[in-house]
C-alpha cells in the first residue's frame, strides 16, 4: 500500500502552502525506500537516493515556481510514481449570511473569506438551541445537529425547512480543503432574519370622476404561506412623474385609495411588506406600477342610501360633475369615495420631501 496519505481532492495531487516547507511523497514505493526525484520533462536530479529522506522530497519555502509535476524513481530506475504539487492556503472561516422570506423556512448562503486556491467543499449543518437556564444549554437528539441540505445546483446555499419561528438556531458552515478545515458558527433567529418578498400583482387604476384619486391593489407574495398564521402589513409609496420625493402611507389591507394625486399626471406607485408584528425587516420595494387619475366627470349612479335626499345631493353631484381643472392642483381631493366610510380618517399619510 502507498506510504502517502490521500488528501481530499483529485488523485495524484499533493498540496502545500506558499512560503512554507513542503514534503512530497512518492506513492509507488514502500515507506522509507530511497528514491530519486526529477521535475517532469527535466533531466536534472532534484534530490538523490542518498538524501536520507527516503521516499519524501522536501522543498524549502515553496513558491509558485515549484508547482507542477514531479517524478520519483527507485534505485533500479523503475518509476515510483508521479506527483503534482499544487500550492494554496488552508481555509479561513467562511462568511455566512442567513435570510427568511417566510416564517417556516430559512436559507443560508456562504462565501470564502479568502480564496484558498485549492479544491474546496463545504459541510453545512444546524441545530436548534435549547436553553434550560440562564447560562446552561442542553443538547439532545431533538436539537440536532442535522444536515442543512445544500442547493443541488451547486449554489453556495442551504435551506432549513420547517423551522420554528420562536426558536434559535446555530448554523455550522465548515470550509474544507486538503490543508485543513475552518468553521463559522452563526446564531440565527427567524424573527430577526425574516424579510418577506415584495408584494405581487400591483395594479394602479384611476377612480372615474375623481381627478385626485388612484386606487392601488396588490396581493401577498407567493412565497408567503397561503394560510398564514402571521399576517403582513404594507407600506405604499407614490409620486407624480418627474417628482423626486415619495409620499408614504401604511394601508390597512391589500388596497389603498390615494386621495391627493396630482390631476392629469401619471404616478408611480410601489409597495413593501413586513410581518405585522414588526419581526425582521421590510421587504424590498415591488416593481413600480403606474397610473393616471381620471379626467372625466363622475359616471357612477347615486348610492342607494341617498334616496329621499335627492335635492340635497343634486347639488353635490352637479359640483362633482363639473369639468376637471385645466391645470394640476396640489391640494388634496377632500371628497370621500364611499360616503359611508371616509378614507381620509383611516390612514396616516407621511410625506417625504
Amino acid at each position: 500500500s502507498s506510504p502517502c496519505p490521500q488528501a481530499w481532492g483529485p488523485p495524484g495531487v499533493q498540496y502545500g502552502q506558499p512560503g512554507r516547507s513542503v514534503k512530497l511523497c512518492c506513492p509507488g514505493v514502500t515507506a522509507g525506500d530511497p528514491v530519486s526525484w526529477f521535475r517532469d520533462g527535466e533531466p536534472k536530479l532534484l534530490q538523490g537516493p542518498d538524501s536520507g529522506l527516503g521516499h519524501e522530497l522536501v522543498l524549502a519555502q515553496a513558491d509558485s515556481t515549484d508547482e507542477g509535476t514531479y517524478i520519483c524513481q527507485t534505485l533500479d530506475g523503475a518509476l515510483g510514481g508521479t506527483v503534482t504539487l499544487q500550492l494554496g492556503y488552508p481555509p479561513a472561516r467562511p462568511v455566512v449570511s442567513c435570510q427568511a422570506a417566510d416564517y417556516e423556512n430559512f436559507s443560508c448562503t456562504w462565501s470564502p473569506s479568502q480564496i484558498s486556491g485549492l479544491p474546496t467543499r463545504y459541510l453545512t449543518s444546524y441545530r436548534k438551541k435549547t436553553v434550560l437556564g440562564a447560562d446552561s444549554q442542553r443538547r439532545s437528539p431533538s436539537t440536532g445537529p442535522w444536515p442543512c441540505p445544500q442547493d443541488p445546483l451547486g449554489a453556495a446555499r442551504c435551506v432549513v425547512h420547517g423551522a420554528e419561528f420562536w426558536s434559535q438556531y446555530r448554523i455550522n458552515v465548515t470550509e474544507v480543503n486538503p490543508l485543513g478545515a475552518s468553521t463559522r458558527l452563526l446564531d440565527v433567529s427567524l424573527q430577526s432574519i425574516l424579510r418577506p418578498d415584495p408584494p405581487q400583482g400591483l395594479r394602479v387604476e384611476s377612480v372615474p370622476g375623481y381627478p385626485r384619486r388612484l386606487r392601488a391593489s396588490w396581493t401577498y407574495p407567493a412565497s408567503w404561506p397561503s394560510q398564514p398564521h402571521f399576517l403582513l402589513k404594507f407600506r405604499l409609496q407614490y409620486r407624480p412623474a418627474q417628482h423626486p420625493a415619495w409620499s408614504t402611507v401604511e394601508p390597512a389591507g391589500l388596497e389603498e385609495v390615494i386621495t391627493d394625486a396630482v390631476a392629469g399626471l401619471p404616478h408611480a406607485v410601489r409597495v413593501s411588506a413586513r410581518d405585522f408584528l414588526d419581526a425582521g425587516t421590510w421587504s424590498t420595494w415591488s416593481p413600480e406600477a403606474w397610473g393616471t387619475p381620471s379626467t372625466g366627470p363622475l359616471q357612477d349612479e347615486i348610492p342607494d342610501w341617498s334616496q329621499g335626499h335627492g335635492q340635497q345631493l343634486e347639488a353635490v353631484v352637479a359640483q362633482e360633475d363639473s369639468p376637471a381643472p385645466a391645470r394640476p392642483s396640489l391640494q388634496p381631493d377632500p371628497r370621500p369615495l364611499d360616503h359611508r366610510d371616509p378614507l381620509e380618517q383611516h390612514h396616516h399619510h407621511h410625506h417625504h420631501h
Epitope: 479561513a92 462568511v95 449570511s97 448562503t109 462565501s111 470564502p112 473569506s113 479568502q114 480564496i115 453556495a156
Partner: antibody
Framework: EVQLLESGGGLVQPGGSLRLSCAAS????????MGWVRQAPGKGLEWVSS????????IYADSVKGRFTISRDNSKNTLYLQMNSLRAEDTAVYYC???????????WGQGTLVTVSS | DIQMTQSPSSLSASVGDRVTITCQAS??????LNWYLHKPGKAPKLLIY???NLQTGVPSRFSGSGSGTDFTFTITSLQPEDFGTYYC?????????FGPGTTVDIK
C-alpha cells in the same frame, strides 16, 4: 508589499453623498476579504463594512446600514464605499483594510478624511 | 453585538517599563482577538492576532494571552517607538468591534 491607498474624502454637507476608493497593490486583490474602518476625531476605531472576495456578501455596522454601500471591482483592484445621507457623526478618517487568513484588518491604508458639515 | 472594554484607558510609563493592558469581551470570543498600535496620522499596525500570535516583523517584546472573554497584552520593555494608542479588536462575529483604546504616553 501590500499597499492600500484611499481617496475620495473631502468636505460634504449633511444629507450629501461621497464615494471613497481604495486602490490595492502587492497582492492578489480578488482573493481577499476587504473592509472599511473609521476613526472620528478624538474617538476610537470603528468597523464600518466588509465584503467577501466575490462581492456576493456584504456586511455593515448598524450605524451605516441602509446609507453606505461597499463594493469592489476585482478587475481594477479597487474597493469602494458609497456614502449617502451623510451625517455630522460620519465625520472621520476612513481606512481601507485587508483581511488575511480569516484575521480581520491585518493590513491598512493611510486613510482619507471625510468631513460632514454645513 | 459584542462590546469590548479595555483598561486602563491611559497610562504613563518610562522607557524600559513593563506595560500590561487588559481587554474584556461581553461574551465568549474564543481566541479571535487582535491587538493594534495606532499613532496619530499613521495607519493602525497589527501586533498580535488570534490572541497570542505575534504578527510577522513585530518585535518579541510584545505578547498577548487569554481566551474566552479575558485577554492581556504585555510589552516587556517599553521602547520610545511604542508610545501611542493600543486597541483590542474581536473578530469572532461578522461584525468586528474594537475596544475604546489605551493611550500609552511618556512619564
Amino acid at each position: 508589499e501590500v499597499q492600500l491607498l484611499e481617496s475620495g474624502g473631502g468636505l460634504v454637507q449633511p444629507g450629501g453623498s461621497l464615494r471613497l476608493s481604495c486602490a490595492a497593490s502587492g497582492f492578489t486583490f480578488s482573493r481577499y476579504m476587504m473592509g472599511w474602518v473609521r476613526q472620528a476625531p478624538g474617538k476610537g476605531l470603528e468597523w464600518v463594512s466588509s465584503i467577501v472576495p466575490s462581492g456576493g456578501i456584504t456586511i455593515y455596522a448598524d450605524s451605516v446600514k441602509g446609507r453606505f454601500t461597499i463594493s469592489r471591482d476585482n478587475s481594477k483592484n479597487t474597493l469602494y464605499l458609497q456614502m449617502n445621507s451623510l451625517r455630522a457623526e460620519d465625520t472621520a478618517v476612513y481606512y481601507c483594510a485587508r483581511d488575511h487568513m480569516g484575521i480581520v484588518a491585518t493590513d491598512w491604508g493611510q486613510g482619507t478624511l471625510v468631513t460632514v458639515s454645513s | 453585538d459584542i462590546q469590548m472594554t479595555q483598561s486602563p484607558s491611559s497610562l504613563s510609563a518610562s522607557v524600559g517599563d513593563r506595560v500590561t493592558i487588559t481587554c474584556q469581551a461581553s461574551q465568549d470570543i474564543t481566541n479571535y482577538l487582535n491587538w493594534y498600535l495606532h499613532k496619530p496620522g499613521k495607519a493602525p499596525k497589527l501586533l498580535i492576532y488570534d490572541a497570542s500570535n505575534l504578527q510577522t516583523g513585530v518585535p518579541s517584546r510584545f505578547s498577548g494571552s487569554g481566551s474566552g472573554t479575558d485577554f492581556t497584552f504585555t510589552i516587556t520593555s517599553l521602547q520610545p517607538e511604542d508610545f501611542g494608542t493600543y486597541y483590542c479588536q474581536q473578530y469572532d462575529t461578522l461584525h468586528p468591534s474594537f475596544g475604546p483604546g489605551t493611550t500609552v504616553d511618556i512619564k
